[in-house]
């Protein structure tokens, strides 16, 4: 009889994760009698995948019934393939004995597993930043194979170019991970903006995966403050308004001070949203002029999103208000203007970063 050969016809097989892999093997002779075993890898550390003779291999099924008369087909099917199954598989013929003796191996079939990347997860900065600042967003996706992968960043549909991407590990592995960090410059209009991380891979059939993050989680838009006085009312009461505009997020505390003493504290809640996602808030304070001998210094103090308080002051001139009548009012508007406020805020952020 001709000498037995063990034929593994495919040098390589590629399978999508979750599917079954068929590894083909045939022997050219019934002689010598003895079982087939399948191993992954070679040498003393090789892993037994299937033995015709003994063992329990729940994921492995022989393609041909081993009890079939004159069987020379020793192909196997491995179910529910995962990236951990990648490797080179060898069909090995044993000669009957006590114990059975290894006789001849096939040339091996390399199994590569096509595994989809996990849904990209985009994470933003731990602390909020204000407009004109640059913040970093990180995108991560794991468990894909093969290694080749494409990642793009978008902000409101526009592709970004300032990002750095790494695929790990650098060497051969059963599966890979990608991590990319994009730098995004914030503007005051970014409350409704979104960054998108898009991952394209051979397993996705041209339908990339996307992960998103809302810039609303990363941005702080400081408020503009304006304090104004309405005309004197007949009952010698002056209505002073503090308008807090264009801020985000909503977390804001407003305190009125009369001559440095706390008069009232309010917390912003359930405010209507502006088109751009920011909020406005107006607070009124009624000052009884007749109760004061001297001018009253009113201060609107705003603490926004845990940042240092910002003040806007306004002086109500008592001398300009005869006690029995209320016509003209003389008021002095003092305190930081809007640009100063923003400068203060910027300084505050530089201090934190």
């Amino acid at each position: 009889e001709e000498e037995l050969q063990v034929i593994q016809p495919e040098k390589s097989v590629s399978v999508a994760a979750g599917e079954s892999a068929t590894l083909n093997c045939t022997a050219t002779s019934l002689i010598p009698v003895g079982p087939i075993q399948w191993f992954r890898g070679v040498g003393p550390g090789r892993e037994l995948i299937y033995s015709q003779k003994e063992g329990h291999f729940p994921r492995v099924t022989p393609v041909s019934d081993p009890t079939k008369r004159n069987n020379m087909d020793f192909s196997i099917r491995i179910s529910n393939i995962t990236p951990a199954d990648a490797g080179t598989y060898y069909c090995v013929k044993f000669r009957k004995g006590s114990p059975d003796v290894e006789l001849k191996s096939g040339a091996g079939t390399e199994l590569s597993v096509r595994a989809k990347p996990s849904a990209p997860v985009v994470s933003g900065p731990a602390v909020r930043a204000t407009a004109e600042h640059t913040v970093s967003f990180t995108c991560e996706s794991h468990g894909f194979s093969p290694r080749d992968i494409t990642l793009k960043w978008f902000k409101n549909g526009n592709e970004l170019s300032d990002f750095q991407t790494n695929v790990d590990p650098a060497g051969k592995s059963v599966s890979y991970s990608i991590r990319s960090t994009a730098r995004v410059v914030l503007t005051r209009r970014d409350v409704h903006s979104q960054v998108i991380c898009e991952v394209a891979h051979v397993t996705l059939q041209g339908d990339p995966l996307r992960g998103t993050a809302n810039l609303s989680e990363a941005i702080r838009v400081p408020p503009f403050l304006e304090v104004t006085q309405q005309s004197m009312r007949a009952d010698n009461q002056v209505n002073v308004t503090c308008q807090v505009t264009k801020f985000y997020p909503q977390r804001l505390q407003l305190t009125w001070l009369e001559n440095g003493n706390v008069s009232r504290t309010e917390m912003a809640s359930a405010l209507p949203e502006n088109k751009d996602g920011t909020y406005n808030w107006t607070s009124w304070l009624l000052v009884n002029v007749s109760a004061h001998r001297d001018d009253v210094k009113l201060t609107c103090q705003v603490e926004h999103d845990g940042q240092p308080a910002v003040n806007k002051s306004f002086s109500v001139k008592v001398s300009a208000h005869p006690k029995e009548q209320g016509s003209n009012t003389a008021a002095e508007n003092t305190g930081t203007n809007e640009r100063d406020y923003k400068d203060d805020d910027d300084k505050h952020h530089h201090h934190h970063h």
Partner: antibody
Framework: QVQLVQSGAEVKKPGASVKVSCKAS????????INWVRQAPGQGLEWIAM????????HYNQIFKDRATLTTDTSTSTAYMELRSLRSDDTAVYYC????????????WGRGTLVTVSS | DIVLTQSPDSLAVSLGERATINCRAS??????????IFWYQQKPGQPPKLLIY???NLDPGVPDRFSGSGSGTDFTLTISSLQAEDVAVYYC????????FGQGTKLEIK
Amino acid sequence: QVQLVQSGAEVKKPGASVKVSCKASGYTFTNYWINWVRQAPGQGLEWIAMIDPSDSETHYNQIFKDRATLTTDTSTSTAYMELRSLRSDDTAVYYCAMDYGSLYAMDYWGRGTLVTVSS
Amino acid sequence: DIVLTQSPDSLAVSLGERATINCRASKSVSSSGYNYIFWYQQKPGQPPKLLIYLASNLDPGVPDRFSGSGSGTDFTLTISSLQAEDVAVYYCQHSRELPTFGQGTKLEIK
């Protein structure tokens, strides 16, 4: 290593039935045929039947087709051979044997079970 | 059914001499290039033991003084130099169809 351990000797009356067991170890029970062979005192070997434990496919010698039934219990890796309507000429040693090469041969044998049929 | 006929029924051979046992099938037991004949040795009080498979292949552990030959319908088991422990009954078996055994050949020392 492959082992086939058979049940103990039986004495039966004519017309009765006997069920001989064969417990396999050292290999995957469902991957190999089990054969049953008998040998009357001072006589030659007589093939009875064979069974594939994976799906209970059986092949019988026509002589025994109506009286013998082969079964397996894969949970205990045990094969059984029941012979009904026993006659005195059924007195024999009954062997189970495993076919290691799927060649319908008998590579490994149990030690045999003596069944004596006597009134 | 294929009938196997062994000859002789019994045989006495001197120690160290060659012993030859024949097995003839009532029709060919060859298929796909293989000869489906097997030889067994049975010693008193023991189960049979496989010696030769597919006509000419020595089962592992069997001394190489045993050999098998033949094709089609005529087959031979040869013991090149008889040893005392070879005293036994020898059976041929075919598996071209469902198995049957030859009637056996008793081998003794002369």
